[in-house]
C-alpha cells in the first residue's frame, strides 16, 4: 500500500499530522473510539507549538485529549512518554479530585477555557480532537 | 507473501505461566496493528488482545486483563503474549492475526491474515 | 460489550443453490461519520484459521470469490452465498470492529444438502 500525503476531507494539515475538531461532545472511551473508527487517536500534545495550534482551533472550551490515567500512571495513547514529554498543566493539576460527587476521582485529561490542561470525570461529554500522521500514518491504496 | 507463525503453545499446570511468540513476514510489521485470537476446543472464536504498530497501546478483552501482556519488538517482526495465572477456561488455539487497519497509531479490528495457531493447554 | 447473534445456527443447503446466514448486532456498528458498518465475516473450515471474506459489511476482501456477498447496515447483516460449492462447507462467523472488545457471533454451520 501507499502512504497517506494528504489530509482527509474536513481535516487540517498542521507540521505533518492531521487534526479533526469535534463540534459535539462525548465521554472520554466514545472520544476515543470514534477517533480509532478513523484511523487516528486522541490529540497527543508534544510541544509547545503543537499546543498552540490546538488552542487556536478549539477556542475556550473543555476539550478531550489522548491523555489520562485510567490504570495508575499517565499515559499518552500512541504510546508517547509522559515523564520526559511536554506538559501543560494548570496549578495545581492534575488533582485526581473526588469532590465532584459523580464516583471516583479524574482520570482523563483536556483543555481548559484557557488551553491549559486539567484532569475530570472521563465521563464528561467534551467535545475532542482526533490526530493522525501524514507519511507513515497509513497503508491505505490510493483511490483509483 | 504474507506469514504469521505461532509458537510457544504447550501442556501448564493452573496458575502457570507461558509465552507465545508470533513471527511475521511478508509485510510491513512495524506499520500493522496485531491482535491476538483464541478459540476453545469445539468453540468459537474470542478476541484475546492487540497492540497498535509502534507497540505504544495494547487492549484486552476482560477475561484476560491483569493477566496476560501483549508486546511486540518490531525490529524482529515478531509479537508476544505473555499470559500468567493460567486458568482451565484458557485451554484453546491461539491464533495471532494481522489487523487489516491502514493506520500505525490505530487499531482497526478486522483481521486479514491468520497463522495457524499454536495450543494452549492448561491442566492439572 | 456489543453481542454478535447469528441465524440460523446451521444449515444445509443443495450445492449451486443460494445459502443466505444473518447476523444481528446488540448495537449498531454505523459510524455515522464515515458511513461505514464495522462488520466483518470469517469462515473457518476443519483445522484451519479463519479466512476473512468481508469488511465494512459489504466490501469483499481480495481473491475471495464473487458469489460471496455481503449487506446490511446498523445491527442487521447478511452473508450471502449465490451457489454453494463444496468448497463453501465451513462455519462462518460474523465480528464487530466497532468497539472494543471486538466480538464474534457463535458462528453458522453451512454443510451441503
Known amino acids: 500500500g501507499s502512504e497517506r500525503t494528504c489530509c482527509p476531507v474536513n481535516w487540517v494539515e498542521h507540521e505533518r499530522s492531521c487534526y479533526w475538531f469535534s463540534r459535539s461532545g462525548k465521554a472520554w472511551a466514545d472520544a476515543d473510539n470514534y477517533c480509532r473508527l478513523e484511523d487516528a487517536h486522541l490529540v497527543v500534545v508534544t510541544s509547545w507549538e503543537e499546543q498552540k495550534f490546538v488552542q487556536h482551533h478549539i477556542g475556550p472550551v473543555n476539550t478531550w485529549m489522548g491523555l489520562h490515567d485510567q490504570n495508575g500512571p499517565w499515559k499518552w495513547v500512541d504510546g508517547t512518554d509522559y515523564e520526559t514529554g511536554f506538559k501543560n498543566w494548570r496549578p495545581e493539576q492534575p488533582d485526581d479530585w473526588y469532590g465532584h460527587g459523580l464516583g471516583g476521582g479524574e482520570d482523563c485529561a483536556h483543555f481548559t477555557d484557557d488551553g491549559r490542561w486539567n484532569d475530570d470525570v472521563c465521563q464528561r461529554p467534551y467535545r475532542w480532537v482526533c490526530e493522525t500522521e501524514l507519511d507513515k500514518a497509513s497503508q491505505e491504496p490510493p483511490l483509483l | 507473501e504474507v506469514q504469521l507463525l505461532e509458537s510457544g503453545g504447550g501442556l501448564v499446570q493452573p496458575g502457570g505461566s507461558l509465552r507465545l511468540s508470533c513471527a511475521a513476514s511478508?509485510?510491513?510489521?512495524?506499520?500493522?496493528?496485531m491482535t491476538w485470537v483464541r478459540q476453545a476446543p469445539g468453540k468459537g472464536l474470542e478476541w484475546v488482545s492487540a497492540?497498535?504498530?509502534?507497540?505504544?497501546?495494547?487492549y484486552y478483552a476482560d477475561s484476560v486483563k491483569g493477566r496476560f501482556t501483549i508486546s511486540r519488538d518490531n525490529s524482529k517482526n515478531t509479537l508476544y503474549l505473555q499470559m500468567n495465572s493460567l486458568r482451565t477456561e484458557d485451554t484453546a488455539v491461539y491464533y495471532c492475526?494481522?489487523?487489516?487497519?491502514?493506520?500505525?497509531?490505530?487499531?482497526?479490528?478486522?483481521?486479514?491474515?491468520w497463522g495457524q495457531g499454536t495450543l494452549v493447554t492448561v491442566s492439572s | 460489550d456489543i453481542v454478535m447473534t447469528p441465524s440460523p445456527d446451521s444449515l444445509a443447503v443443495s450445492l449451486g443453490e443460494r445459502a443466505t446466514i444473518n447476523c444481528k448486532s446488540s448495537?449498531?456498528?454505523?459510524?455515522?461519520?464515515?458511513?461505514?458498518?464495522?462488520l466483518a465475516w470469517y469462515q473457518q473450515k476443519p483445522g484451519q484459521p479463519p479466512k476473512l471474506l468481508i469488511y465494512?459489511?459489504?466490501t469483499r476482501e481480495s481473491g475471495v470469490p464473487d458469489r460471496f456477498s455481503g449487506s446490511g447496515s446498523g445491527t442487521d447483516f447478511t452473508l450471502s452465498i449465490s451457489s454453494l460449492q463444496a468448497e463453501d462447507v465451513a462455519v462462518y462467523y460474523c465480528?464487530?470492529?466497532?468497539?472494543?472488545?471486538?466480538?464474534f457471533g457463535p458462528g453458522t454451520k453451512v454443510d451441503n444438502k
Open positions: 492475526a494481522k489487523d487489516r487497519g491502514y493506520s500505525r497509531i490505530a487499531v482497526a479490528g478486522t483481521f486479514d491474515y
Open positions: 511478508g509485510f510491513t510489521f512495524s506499520s500493522s496493528a
Open positions: 497492540i497498535i504498530g509502534n507497540g505504544g497501546r495494547a
Open positions: 448495537q449498531s456498528v454505523l459510524h455515522s461519520s464515515n458511513n461505514k458498518n464495522y
Open positions: 465494512w459489511a459489504s
Open positions: 465480528q464487530q470492529s466497532y468497539t472494543i472488545p471486538f466480538t
